[in-house]
């Protein structure tokens, strides 16, 4: 069919979920199956992400938004938008190239992911070790003997462990 073009881009009126179809004289066509456009004015629709293998579907693809994946049990997400799945380990372990390995003496991991971190060095704060560390738990620092006065109790737990790659707030 013939149509008079307005001065504006004919594609600008295509809403999310459609694309400006060159095969149809630049009118807006719905996105084909298994594709989406999340913004208006698109000249193509993007192929939906498929959550296969160790990935599982957290949110189905729609004509206006991509699918979202997470990981099957025993794995956790890594990277933006869960671009990778990494194997879980037990608390007290870290993932190496050879698989899950126990934390070395003097280190701990209280999560199923991430690396083993050194126990807190209580003496750096002039404290003493109140509760010994394990592979799964950090030490608990207590007061130095000089700090103890009758009726006073001053137990300082160490700062909570941070996940690697996250900066403190």
């Amino acid at each position: 069919f013939e149509r008079t073009r307005s001065l504006q881009d004919p594609c600008s009126n295509c809403p999310a979920g459609t694309f400006c179809d060159n095969n149809r004289n630049q009118i807006c066509s719905p996105c084909p199956p298994n594709s989406f456009s999340s913004a208006g004015g698109q000249r193509t629709c993007d192929i939906c992400r498929q959550c296969k293998g160790v990935f599982r579907t957290r949110k189905e693809c729609s004509s206006t938004s991509n699918a979202e994946c997470d990981c099957t049990p025993g794995f956790h997400c890594l990277g933006a938008g869960c671009s990778m799945c990494e194997q879980d380990c037990k608390q007290g372990q870290e993932l190496t190239k050879k698989g899950c390995k126990d934390c070395c003496f003097g280190t701990f991991n209280d999560q199923k992911r991430g690396i083993c971190r050194p126990w807190t060095n209580c003496s750096l704060d002039g404290k003493s070790v109140l509760v010994n560390g394990t592979k799964e738990r950090d030490v608990v620092c207590g007061p130095s003997p000089a700090d103890l006065s009758p009726g006073a109790s001053s137990v300082t737990p160490p700062a909570p462990a941070r996940e690697p790659g996250h900066s403190p707030q």
Epitope: G17, D21, N23, R24, S29, P30, P32, P33, S62, S63
Partner: nanobody, 121 residues
């Protein structure tokens, strides 16, 4: 082939309602999407709303919240319920059926003859 026949157009006052119908016949088993477009005199043919075989709906921003596209599979008919009509909704409304996607384009593209909608006091 797919044959499409629109009905339900007419003259309505601003704020009024109309329901357009698009009856499909022929090779309807292969329809992926039914789409409503409209064309005002001297203007381009604009997307209004679409509904896919899976029931997914899309609306142009200008009609969102006022128009509703639906279908009755038993009657092979697609509807466009138009509420709170405005003078700028005046146009010829066309029904369009799209076949399955072959990776490059829709395999077919059939149009109805159009039905006039005029919104005026």
């Amino acid at each position: 082939a797919v044959q499409l026949v629109e009905s339900g157009g007419g003259l309505v006052q601003p704020g009024g309602s109309l329901r357009l119908s698009c009856a499909a016949s022929g090779s309807i088993f292969s329809i992926y999407a039914m789409v409503w477009y409209r064309q005002a005199p001297g203007k381009q043919r604009d997307f209004v709303a679409s509904i896919t075989s899976g029931g997914s709906t899309i609306y142009a921003d200008s009609v969102k919240g006022r128009f509703t596209i639906s279908r009755d599979n038993a009657k092979n008919t697609t509807y466009l319920q138009m509420n709170s009509l405005k003078p700028e909704d005046t146009a010829v409304y066309y029904c369009n059926s799209l076949g399955s996607w072959d990776g490059e384009r829709y395999e077919y593209d059939y149009w109805g003859q159009g039905t006039q909608v005029t919104v005026s006091s």
